[in-house]
């Protein structure tokens, strides 16, 4: 008993310590360690039924999807999948967990967000962090050098998510990737085209796609005087420029990451620039940057990319942004990120980004990491941030107070009198067999008013009403729920009439 009391006190003290560290904005690693200690203490404490009421909830960073939310989700997925298929993609699936070794060393600073599974008898496993690394593993394992595929699945990140902004620990990713040796920038341009098609089709508001190139970034850091070992960590600071001011980024680079102030200033001169193809041209003339082989390659490819984007009719949606430095270690070339734009408060102001909704880039070295001979398979791809899109679509529908149908039922089989359950069962079965989406109420003698009310609530457009007289006449009364108009339809014509009214093809092909 004394031991339990001591442990309870330690849990309380450790909890206070964690809160204190968070308030002091202590280092992420220290907070992470102290939180881990707190969890270990709690695990030793175990359940105490007398004190602890089990709180029924989903784990942190996860959520259930209601039928309404699922209806939204399916509509969003439908738009995305149609687009992926329009561009000739095949579909694959991979396990939700991978060997830990597969994921190690692929994500740089983000590796700490990977969920490791408890040992299940020998194999060290981790939940997948994205769909790209498993895709690269799939290519290497199957010795594939050429594929255009999409993959829609859940991924897992041990993040501290702001769920109100559509960020979770378990969330869907919708990825499209092109693997293979092709002429420069053609697949990359198609990926950007796909991104623009999807975001336009979803009608979630105006957007901008920021584009940069890892080689330009690395070249720029080199000429500014950043040592190789600091490239990645400085990248992660630069990437924050869409959220915080240059001053704050500079302070982080100098104060926390040990960069010389004059080096930071040189970086600042570059990364605060954004524009179109004219900026690419301008940088190709830059006396320092144009002398760097990597940067020159990157700028040459971007010039070509802009030509293709113009031909695809999307150049107005693209901005060359030198501050874009996507966090993942595996990018090697072009990188891009789509952000939704808030309407500016006043005319003449710059549009404000409200968060990334899609991103991607070229990763030519990732497959080679899995190949015993290091054979490379060039890849380029994109990922649609559907969770954020779901949130935006849901909010928009709520604001419009739009009713969303959560079922696809075309017709309710109803009866106007008692003792007609058998007839309703026979008719609904006929309709199901003919491919009609039909329902009936699970009552022997439902009131007609209740049946009609159910249709109103569920958004079912038609009611097929059986009555004694109709049975004698060999007809069914077909009623439109919205107009309340009723017509007698011969029983043998009912299927065709329902299909005609609901715009369904007449044969199940």
């Amino acid at each position: 008993m004394a031991e339990r009391a001591a442990l309870e006190e330690l849990v309380k003290l450790q909890g206070e310590r964690v809160r204190g560290l968070k308030q002091q904005k202590a280092s992420a690693e220290l907070i992470e360690e102290e939180v881990a200690k707190l969890l270990k203490l709690k695990a030793q404490l175990g359940p105490d039924e007398s004190k602890q009421k089990f709180v029924l909830k989903t784990p942190k960073g996860t959520r259930d999807y209601s039928p309404r939310q699922m209806a939204v989700r399916e509509k969003v997925f439908d738009v995305i999948i149609r687009c992926f298929k329009r561009h000739g993609a095949e579909v694959i699936d991979t396990p939700v967990f991978e060997l830990k070794e597969t994921l190690m060393g692929k994500y740089g600073e983000d590796s700490k967000l990977i969920y490791d599974l408890k040992d299940q008898g020998g194999e060290l496993l981790s939940l997948r962090y994205d769909l790209t690394v498993p895709f690269a593993r799939y290519l290497a394992m199957n010795k594939l050098t050429n594929i255009k595929r999409y993959h829609i699945a859940k991924v897992y990140r041990r993040d501290n998510p702001a769920m109100t902004r559509g960020r979770y620990r378990e969330f869907y990713q919708c990825d499209f990737d092109i693997a293979g040796n092709f002429d420069p920038m053609i697949p990359d341009a198609e990926c950007l085209k796909i991104m623009c098609e999807i975001l336009s089709s979803l009608q979630i508001g105006d957007f901008l796609v920021k584009v940069n190139d890892r080689r330009i970034l690395d070249g720029m850091f080199a000429i500014c005087g950043v040592s190789d070992s600091k490239f990645r960590t400085i990248c992660s600071s630069v990437d924050k420029l869409d959220k915080v001011s240059w001053e704050e980024v500079k302070n982080e680079m100098v104060g926390e990451k040990g960069l010389a102030p004059e080096v930071a200033d040189r970086i600042g001169d570059y990364v605060q620039q954004h524009g179109g193809v004219s900026l690419v041209e301008q940088l190709l003339q830059d006396p320092k940057l144009s002398q760097n082989k990597q940067a020159l390659e990157g700028l040459g490819d971007l010039k070509l990319l802009f030509e293709y984007l113009t031909l695809f009719g999307i150049d107005d949606k693209i901005s060359f942004d030198l501050s874009l430095a996507r966090g993942l270690d595996y990018y090697t070339g072009v990188i891009y990120e789509a952000v939704l734009l808030q309407t500016p408060a006043q005319a003449g102001e710059e549009p404000l980004g409200v968060g990334s909704v899609a991103a991607g880039g070229r990763y030519d070295g990732l497959v080679g990491m899995f190949d015993p001979k290091g054979r490379k398979v060039p890849c380029v791809g994109l990922s649609i941030g559907v969770e954020r899109i779901f949130s935006i679509v849901e909010q928009r529908l709520e604001a419009l107070e739009e009713k969303i149908r959560t079922t696809e039922t075309q017709v309710l089989v109803a009866s106007a009198q008692k003792k007609l359950l058998e007839e309703r069962l026979k008719l609904v079965s006929e309709l199901w067999d003919a491919g009609i989406k039909a329902e009936l109420l699970y009552k022997k003698n439902p009131k007609l008013l209740n049946q009609l009310q159910y249709c109103e609530e569920a958004g079912i457009p038609l009611v097929a009403i059986i009555g004694e007289q109709e049975l004698k006449d060999g007809v069914i009364k077909l009623r439109s729920v919205t107009s309340r108009e009723e017509v007698d339809v011969r029983r043998e014509d009912l299927v065709e009439e329902i299909k005609r009214r609901t715009g369904q093809p007449l044969c199940i092909c």
């Epitope: 006190e9 330690l10 003290l13 310590r17 360690e33 881990a36 200690k37 270990k40 203490l41 030793q44």
Partner: antibody, heavy 120, light 107 residues
Framework: QVQLVESGGGLVKPGGSLRLSCAAS????????MSWIRQAPGKGLEWVSY????????KYTPSVRGRFTISRDNAKNSLYLQMNSLRAEDTAVYYC?????????????WGQGTLVTVSS | DIQMTQSPSSVSASVGDRVTITCRAS??????LAWFQQKPGKAPKLLIF???NLESGVPSRFSGSGSGTDFTLTISSLQPEDFATYYC?????????FGQGTKLEIK
């Protein structure tokens, strides 16, 4: 019962190296943070370093940082301290110690200690 | 680093006496304090953790109190086996530091 047995101490010249080991038994070693604590002859106690249960976190007192490396092998129930560039002021009895309740930085079990003497 | 200051550095007492040793932290450490007993040639032994919790197997004549910066170890009735050196230690933040010790001697 809980047992910690240190080994590897001895006489070494300044600038030399030593590797201390600690063999643990009587508890689930892989669940516990572990530490090295030292005591110079006739002096007080100094917490040198610690390592977390799965080796994810390690820390060192400033005077040894960059010279000492703590490590563990959970499969062998062993804790180690690699000491390089040794100085006269590192002379002490080195104790291997277990954290209280797995993660609390209070040593609830200690070894008998191993003496390290740094002298020319 | 957090400095721990013990007083007195040494104390003489007789069997049956009540003895109090104090420990002061250079900054607030909540209740993250432990007391150890060490006898010559032996490893320290944990007596009290988080200021006032008695480690199992430690006689109830030992007690601890305090929080923040000021802490006390009390031995209510000294026994012959209690003559030793006593150390306090803060477990609030790394590097975890010990007091310089209080030597309890027979009068």
């Amino acid at each position: 019962q809980v047992q910690l047995v240190e080994s590897g101490g001895g006489l070494v010249k300044p600038g030399g190296s030593l590797r201390l080991s600690c063999a643990a038994s009587g508890f689930t070693f892989s669940d516990y943070y572990m530490s090295w604590i030292r005591q110079a002859p006739g002096k007080g106690l100094e917490w040198v370093s610690y390592i977390s249960d799965k080796s994810r976190y390690t820390k060192y007192t400033p005077s040894v940082r960059g010279r000492f490396t703590i490590s563990r092998d959970n499969a062998k129930n062993s804790l180690y301290l690699q000491m390089n560039s040794l100085r006269a002021e590192d002379t002490a009895v080195y104790y291997c110690a277990r954290y209280l309740y797995q993660v609390i930085a209070i040593a609830d079990a200690w070894g008998q200690g191993t003496l390290v003497t740094v002298s020319s | 680093d957090i400095q721990m200051t013990q007083s007195p550095s040494s104390v003489s007492a007789s069997v049956g006496d009540r003895v109090t040793i104090t420990c002061r932290a250079s900054q607030g450490i909540s209740s993250w304090l432990a007391w150890f007993q060490q006898k010559p040639g032996k490893a320290p032994k944990l007596l009290i953790f988080v200021a006032s919790n008695l480690e199992s197997g430690v006689p109830s004549r030992f007690s601890g109190s305090g929080s923040g910066t000021d802490f006390t170890l009390t031995i209510s009735s000294l026994q012959p086996e209690d003559f030793a050196t006593y150390y306090c230690q803060q477990a609030e933040s790394f590097p975890y530091t010990f007091g310089q010790g209080t030597k309890l001697e027979i009068k």
